[in-house]
Interface confidence: low
């Protein structure tokens, strides 16, 4: 691998609809890890500062952004779902967490480094009760 | 797996203000229904994934669709999939 | 959009007290988290304490039993009661308020802390 072109993620959250909590009484949150380089990272949900697995389901694997390019750069989604009433909790904060294998981008790179930095990039969103 | 009531739904949801990527929600739909990749190169979808949520005894499938780009909507993201008409729900503007 | 704005900083001696406040205003009612945050020079920026809207607090550990954060909800304020301050405590110190998504994340400009016989 090219260790100039490294790119960590961009990692964004996404609230859920009104209109599934409405219909369904549950609500997906989602969350985009996206414009990586390599594809090694790792997923994860915390709740109220806890990991959690029920309720998550992420992308086996990353997916490439532009598939023709030998290079592309990476992107990988989850998405957590939860009960109505937990989302509306205010007092309840959800994050994404995305831990990414390689160089920040201000980060130096010096060939003598034997392993990459492990970096954590997340994106949090609360509960609403309200607007 | 086995989706017990399937109820197939597209869902708009929203990031921050400063956020230009939109995305998209195929959510509750049937297990022999296939999620297609876009033709178009600045859409990305996700192949179908299936969602635990064990606490409520529930399983559902899910696939994502996103882009940056401004005209992107909900209702074209999977045109091919084959989505039913009434599977789309709007956004109500947020009044926040 | 959300203003912060600190102050409370200084010059102290080692073993004395200030008390740190931030005013947040603007949408102040879609903030559920404050933080204070310190940065010392020629080092990165690390957390001191949390508190979230339930008025749940978070410290990091070498602020745990010296400092105190508590907040005035009427004031949209939040302080930062620092006791037996060290020398190693010396940093611009930053208030962080998040929203209720992601990334509404909000800092202010800092106030320093000096502590020095």
């Known amino acids: 691998e090219d260790l100039k072109k490294v790119f960590p993620p961009k990692v964004a959250v996404f609230e859920p609809s009104e209109a599934e909590i409405s219909h369904t009484q549950k609500a997906t949150l989602v969350c985009l890890a996206t414009g990586f380089y390599p594809d090694h990272v790792e997923l994860s949900w915390w709740v109220n500062g806890k990991e959690v697995h029920s309720g998550v389901s992420t992308d086996p694997q990353p997916l490439k952004e532009q598939p023709a390019l030998e290079d592309s750069r990476y992107s990988l989604s989850s998405r957590l779902r939860v009960s109505a009433t937990f989302w509306h909790n205010p007092r309840n904060h959800f994050r994404c967490q995305v831990q990414f294998y390689g160089l920040s981008e201000d980060d130096e790179w010096t060939e003598d480094r034997d392993k990459p930095i492990t970096q954590k990039i997340s994106a949090e969103a609360w509960g609403r009760a309200d607007c | 797996p086995y989706i017990q009531n399937p109820d197939p739904a597209v869902y708009q949801l929203r990031g921050s203000k400063s956020n230009d990527t939109s995305v998209c929600l195929f959510t509750d739909f049937d297990s022999v229904m296939n999620v297609s990749q876009s033709k178009d190169s600045d859409v990305h979808i996700t192949d179908k994934t299936v969602l635990d949520m064990r606490s409520m005894d529930f399983k559902s499938n899910g696939a994502v669709a996103w882009s940056n780009k401004s005209d992107f909507a909900c209702t074209s993201a999977f045109k091919d999939s084959v989505i039913p008409a009434d599977t789309f729900f709007p956004s109500p503007e947020s009044s926040c | 959009d959300v203003q912060l704005v600190e102050s409370g900083g200084g010059v102290v001696q080692p073993g004395g007290s200030l008390r740190l406040s931030c005013v947040a205003s603007g949408y102040v009612h879609k903030i559920n988290f404050y933080g204070w945050y310190r940065q010392a020079p020629g080092k990165e920026r690390e957390k001191v304490a949390h508190?979230?809207?339930?008025?749940?607090?978070d410290y990091a550990d070498s602020a745990k039993g010296r400092f105190t954060i508590s907040r005035d909800e009427s004031k949209n304020t939040v302080y930062l009661q620092m006791n037996s301050l060290r020398p190693e405590d010396t940093a611009a110190y930053y208030c962080?308020?998040?929203?209720?998504?992601?990334?509404?994340?909000?800092w202010g400009q800092g106030t320093l802390v000096t502590v020095s016989s």
């Open positions: 962080r308020a998040l929203s209720r998504i992601w990334p509404y994340d909000y």
């Open positions: 508190i979230s809207i339930g008025d749940q607090t």
